[in-house]
């Protein structure tokens, strides 16, 4: 049966036993800046092109043991959430991966900047259709990272990022605080903000909307046919990247402002229990859970 | 995220190092009255001191970025400091990434075309 997260983003009139928009997002390229990925996993084979871009810091600790499946875990799962054959949102989207996070899931602002610059140069060398850039990472507020995101957005690229998993104001983190970036918080199957250990999803006025981000089934790098459940604002951002890819594939001329407006318009309103947020943040945090449009032009999204 | 917000720095630290009057032998002095600023991550454990992104003013060309980076290296060498240019940015933002001692920040902030300098910091999978 359909995983809860795919059901949640699917308008009721399209719900069936399975979620299957076969070519959703086929005109769009999604760039993923994350860990290395297992690109030939059955769920994503042929859908993800691993670029030769790699800019990661060394792993911490003298006795760190580099295990391939662990190194690939985060990125493989997210690639599956965006475009996986069976558990992905935009099953027609093609992806390109850049490695900016090491085997411990750690990267640098400078490495991310160089990755964003790589994307811009690729776009100039070989202009394609609409581009979505997924940044499932967060660091402290960074003027330079936000500035780079702004420049890329002004070049027509849609950037989607994780709000952060610090149960804190997203405005204190980057790229979540960049105004031009679509910043995504995480909710669960009960439309509650996601709790992650002692922390949880970030919130506040720098968040644009929420999306499923708890117990999300996706490709596991443990084996070529394995699936695993992961949680976080990265998973939530991957849903929105997939939805954005489907919207842009249906309407390639959409501007960033129009896309943002559509994402908000088609979101489920006032379903999140705001009591979870600090009192002073409740009015500032958008009560929106992302969903696909219940398009009257069915073929736009589901052909 | 969330368009329409003011650009808020939150806890973000901004250290403004005022420019001294003597130009330290620079051929091209920065425009009168402009102050390049230094930024670093407010979360101490995430800081990566020793690596800095030198961001140049918007219209700076690649050749000027390279020249500014070389000038920093030359001036640092005169003071007995080794520096390494790790990357020259162009396409999105003009500037360069440099590995150097924090002692050289004041010098770097006085270079021509410099808009601001940011200390590198960590980002994490979410």
């Amino acid at each position: 049966s359909i995983p809860w997260n795919l059901e949640r983003i699917t308008p009721p009139r399209y719900r069936a036993d399975e979620y299957q928009p076969p070519d959703g997002g086929s005109l769009v390229e999604v760039y993923l800046l994350d860990t290395s990925i297992q690109s030939d996993h059955r769920e994503i084979e042929g859908r993800v092109m691993v670029t030769d871009f790699e800019n990661v810091p060394e792993e911490d600790g003298t006795r760190f043991h580099r295990q391939a499946s662990k190194c690939d875990s985060h990125g493989t799962h997210l690639a599956g959430v965006v475009s996986g054959r069976d558990a992905g949102v935009a099953k027609g989207a093609s992806m390109r991966s850049l490695r900016v996070l090491n085997c411990q899931g750690k990267g640098t602002v400078s490495g991310t900047l160089i990755g964003l610059e790589f994307i811009r140069k690729s776009q100039l060398v070989q202009p394609v259709g609409p581009l979505v850039v997924l940044l499932p990472l967060a660091g402290g507020y960074s003027r330079v990272l936000n500035a780079a995101c702004q420049r890329l957005a002004r070049a027509g690229v849609v950037l989607v990022t994780a709000a952060g998993n610090f149960r804190d104001d997203a405005c204190l983190y980057s790229p979540a605080s960049a105004p031009e970036v679509i910043t995504v918080g995480a909710t669960n199957a009960q439309d509650q903000p996601v709790t992650l250990g002692t922390l949880g999803t970030n919130f506040g006025r720098c968040v644009d909307l929420f999306a499923p981000g708890e117990d999300i089934i996706g490709a596991s790098s443990d084996c070529s046919t394995c699936f695993v459940s992961q949680s976080g604002t990265s998973q939530a951002a991957a849903h929105v990247a997939g939805i954005a890819a489907m919207m842009l594939s249906a309407e390639p001329e959409l501007t960033l402002a129009e896309l943002r407006q559509r994402l908000i318009h088609f979101s489920a309103k006032d379903v999140i229990n705001e009591a979870w947020f600090p009192e002073d943040q409740r009015v500032l945090t958008p009560n929106l859970v992302a969903a696909l449009p219940p398009s009257t032009h069915e073929n736009l999204y589901f052909q | 995220g969330a368009m329409g917000q003011e650009d808020e720095d939150g806890d973000y630290e901004e250290l403004v190092l005022a420019l001294r009057s003597e130009e330290d032998g620079l051929a091209e002095a920065p425009e009168h009255g402009t102050t390049a600023t230094f930024h670093r991550c407010a979360k101490d454990p995430w800081r990566l001191p020793g690596t800095y992104v030198v961001v140049l003013k918007e219209e700076t060309h690649l050749s000027q970025s390279e020249r500014t980076a070389r000038r920093l290296q030359a001036q640092a060498a005169r003071r007995g400091y080794l520096t390494k240019i790790l990357h020259v940015f162009h396409g999105l933002l003009p500037g360069f990434l440099v590995k150097m001692s924090g002692d050289l920040l004041e010098l770097a902030l006085k270079l021509p075309h410099v808009d601001y300098i940011e200390e590198d910091s960590s980002v994490f999978a979410q």
């Epitope: 299957q20 076969p22 297992q38 030939d40 084979e45 | -």
Partner: antibody
């Protein structure tokens, strides 16, 4: 263009081993693994297993597990399938195909097991 | 015994439409979006005609279409032509492997 080129026909005695090669070209090798499929004379298709061109991981069908070994040589973009302890019912055409999706196939290698 | 059940043979006249069924369980056909159909002419390797239930690879005629309902997938060939005479195999993911149907011989009368 995307191509999978296999090694030539083999005749083997029962109990022997056979090693079939499959050279891939024309695509990003790490984006797909290689599946091996066999077809006995006049019969249907049987999936034997898969190997990752990315990290060499394998996934073997239960029926041949323990007798089959798939390996990869990334320097030559070649994948190998070795089947040991051959029996007469292993007589078949052996195909390599791209990925689990099997969208591109090699020309096939006939393996005859006969005493 | 193949894991997926197909009719041994079907036939049709030129111009007609035919449908080949492929029945599995909810552990294969019913559980995944990844049902494929292959055409095989004698002495040749199989050729992918439909992937992921209903998608056609580039270069495949739109006379070929695929669908799925529950645990049964179907391949429909419309406007039957002489060159469509061949064996047709379905395949599906299972949790850890791949399974094929036993094959259907299509005869164009």
């Amino acid at each position: 263009q995307v191509q999978l080129v296999q090694s030539g026909a083999e005749v083997k005695k029962p109990g022997a081993s056979v090693k079939v090669s499959c050279k891939a070209s024309g695509y990003a090798l790490t984006s797909y693994g290689i599946s091996w499929v066999r077809q006995a004379p006049g019969q249907g298709l049987e999936w034997m297993g898969w190997i990752s061109a990315y990290n060499g991981n394998t996934n073997y069908a239960q029926k041949v597990q323990g007798r089959v070994t798939m390996t990869t040589d990334t320097s030559t973009s070649t994948v190998y399938m070795e089947l040991r302890s051959l029996r007469s019912d292993d007589t078949a055409v052996y195909y390599c195909a791209r990925g689990y999706g099997m969208d591109v196939w090699g020309q096939g290698t006939t393996v005859t097991v006969s005493s | 015994q193949s894991a997926l059940t197909q009719p041994a043979s079907v036939s049709g006249s030129p111009g007609q439409s035919i449908t080949i069924s492929c029945t599995g369980t909810n552990s294969d056909v019913g559980g995944y979006n990844s049902v494929s159909w292959y055409q095989q002419h004698p002495g040749k390797p199989p050729k992918l005609m439909i992937y992921e239930v209903s998608n056609r690879p580039s270069g495949i005629s739109n006379r070929f279409s695929g669908s799925k309902s529950g645990n049964t997938a179907s391949l429909t060939i419309s406007g039957l032509q002489a060159e469509d005479e061949a064996d047709y195999f379905c395949s599906s993911y299972t949790s850890t492997s791949m399974v094929f149907g036993g094959g259907t011989k299509l005869t164009v009368l």
